[in-house]
Each structure stands twice: as C-alpha cells, then as structure tokens.
C-alpha cells in the first residue's frame, strides 16, 4: 500500500470514468487512470481507502490502465482518486473523481409552471417530487448543458429559471439523492419549448436519444454539495 | 448466479499452518477476481489477500510472508495456505470474489467484491 509521504515528486495522474460518472444501480463502470510510461503500479482509493491495484504488463501500455468496477452499487458510489508509482517514487494523487449511483429506491414527477411551451422572457419554474423523504433534489438538462441545479426539500423542490432564454430549451429530468452520490430513478422527461423572439424557436434540440449515457457533466462539490461545472464527454479530471 | 464455499478451516497451535479452500460454482471462476477476507471477533472485517483472474496477488500486511493465496482454474477454486499462524489470526475467513473482472485488477476494498462465502472458522491457540 502506498505510503504518504512529503517527498512525491511525480506529477498527478488524470482519472475518469467510462461511459459515465452516472451509472444506474448493478451496472458496471470503467475507471482509467493515466499516469506515466514508466508506471510499474498503479492504485485506486475509495472514498480514502485503498479500492484496488493493477501492474501493467510490460507487453501493453503502461502509462493508463483500467478498473472495473462490476456492479455499480450505493457501496461503490463516492469519490475516486488514483495515484501510481514509477521506481520508488510516487505520484500525488489524481484530482477526484465523483461516481454516482442511479436508480434507487424511487421515481420523482417532474412538471413545468407555467406550462412546458413558453414564450422567450417568461418565467418558469421546475418542480420535483419524490414520496420517499429525501434530503435534495437534482435538476439535470440533457445533452448540449453542463448544469446541474440542486436543491434542500423534504419531497418536493422547486427550481426557478427566471425569465427563460433560448438556451433553456432542452429536456430536463430530475433525481432525488439519499446522499451525494446516491440517486433516485430518474423522472421522466420534460421537455422545454421556447417560442417567439426573432426566430421561430419552439422546436426541442434534435436529440437521438434521451439515455443518460448521453448527459454531459461533472459533479463538483461546494459547501452546499453539487453544483454546475463544466466537463467533457470522458468526464476527466485534471489540471 | 456464483456460490462460494469455503472449507478447511478448524483448530490449530500457534506456529502451524491450515490450508483454506474456496469452491466456486458455475463456468465464470476464470474471469473472476479472488479475495480472502477476515473478521474476528468484535472487530471489522479486514483484508487478507487478493488474486487478479491473470494470477498478480496482494496481501495485507500482518499476513505478507506467511499467507499464500492462489487459484485452480480447472477445479474453480482458490486457495488460501496460512502458515506460521498467530492467535491474532484467529478469525472467520470469508472467500469473495469480482465477477466479471478485467485482466490484471486485484481488488483490496470489500465494497468491490459482488459475491461472498459463508465463511470458515480459523482458531489458533495452544
């Protein structure tokens, strides 16, 4: 097991998560860790407990390697980190990696007020319900956005946009949480129309498809839990 | 659907050594990942050792040099050959396994492993 120490000098490996770092209850999930050529192990943390390790064999690339993750459960939902070892030097540790697990227990209503097709400027709101008590709400626009919105409710919660934009228009589904990383079923979708303005915008964004292997995010923690943040499609971290 | 069953286990004087079995059934073994975990009375379940489905091993390190795990893949079955035992190793032993896993991946944490035995009884004392 790695040691801490004061003197790692190896630059941190990048970590991500394979198709997505939301991964539906029993289902499984990769997560890469890229380090360096001369990596002779790599490990995998937990939650700050030692998860895994893998030594790449000289006969394939050394510098990443993969953890399997078998079935995706609230016990495997949290933060990852990786860190590897080259000679007897060790690296820092990746930047975290935030898994959540989906498709617990319960499944959230979600409507639109007024309506799901407004006019540019007016005001809408989202609410989510969920009957089992629950300590947040997620709100989660699908393809195309970045944004996570979250809110403190009992069952129910309520997303304001303000006056909406054309850069609303989308789908939107929401989740309630039992804690951070363990999510409820998701709601069925919603879609948000916008129309008016210079151009006819009502038509939704052509989307093959509504999976959620499709959503493009990153979870990041704040005082108050997740927020927004920007990620690309592999969900990596790193700088 | 995997069932492990482990065997071997039973009384023994500090310094002996007990070899542990672990049977697993159906036609998955070779692309499972082994463990073998323990918990003794009143305390947490802790690592012992770990096998990846390629045969690269770890060991916790209150065992690292007198445990030896190791696997049969025609029989399905894992091994675990305990020696120089100590009265702290006094334990239930419980086989686990990853199942499927991915090449060389050994696996340290109980939250990984998707299947478990009932466990056997090691006592070591004079």
């Known amino acids: 097991q790695r040691i801490n120490t004061e003197k790692e000098t190896l630059p941190k490996p990048i970590i991500w998560a394979k198709p997505s770092i939301m991964v539906t209850n029993g289902n499984s999930v990769n997560i890469w860790c890229q380090g360096a050529q001369s990596a002779s192990e790599y490990q995998l943390y937990f939650e700050g407990s030692f998860f895994a390790l893998e030594r790449p064999k000289p006969s394939r690339s050394m510098n990443k390697v993969r953890f399997f993750i078998s079935q995706m459960t609230s016990h495997t939902a949290g933060i990852y980190t990786c860190f590897y070892q080259s000679g007897e030097l060790w690296s820092k540790s990746s930047n975290p990696l935030k898994l959540v697990v989906t498709g617990l227990y319960d499944t959230p209503n979600l409507w639109v007020y007024p309506r799901p097709e407004v006019t540019l400027g007016e005001n809408v709101t989202f609410f989510c319900q969920l009957k089992t008590a629950t300590s947040k709400f997620f709100l989660l626009k699908e393809r195309g956005s970045n944004h996570i919105q979250n809110k403190y409710g009992n069952i129910q919660a309520e997303f304001p946009m303000g006056p909406v934009t054309r850069a609303h228009r989308g789908t939107y589904r929401c989740f309630g949480s039992y804690n951070d990383y363990a999510w409820s079923f998701p709601s069925e979708p919603v879609t948000l129309l916008i129309t008016g303005g210079v151009e006819n915008s009502s038509l939704a964004p052509t989307d093959p498809t509504s999976s959620l292997d499709y959503w493009e995010f990153d979870l990041s923690t704040n005082e108050s839990g997740l927020q927004k943040d920007s990620a690309f499609w592999d969900h990596t971290t790193q700088n | 659907e995997v069932q492990l069953v482990e065997s071997g286990g039973g009384e023994v004087q500090p310094g002996g050594s007990l070899r542990l079995s672990c049977a697993a059934s159906g036609r998955t073994f070779a692309s499972a990942a082994m463990g073998w975990f323990r918990q003794a009375p009143g305390k947490e379940r802790e690592f012992v050792a770990a096998?990846?489905?390629?045969?690269?091993?770890y060991y916790a390190e209150s065992v690292k040099g007198r445990f030896t795990i190791s696997r049969d893949n025609a029989k399905n079955t894992v091994y675990l050959q305990m020696s120089s035992l100590r009265a702290e190793d006094t334990a239930v032993y419980y086989c686990?396994?990853?199942?499927?896993?991915?090449?060389?991946?050994?696996?340290?944490?109980?939250?990984?492993?998707?299947?478990w035995g009932q466990g056997t009884l090691v006592t070591v004392k004079p």
């Open positions: 686990a396994a990853v199942v499927p896993t991915y090449g060389s991946n050994i696996y340290v944490h109980s939250a990984a492993y998707n299947y």
């Open positions: 096998i990846s489905r390629s045969d690269d091993t």
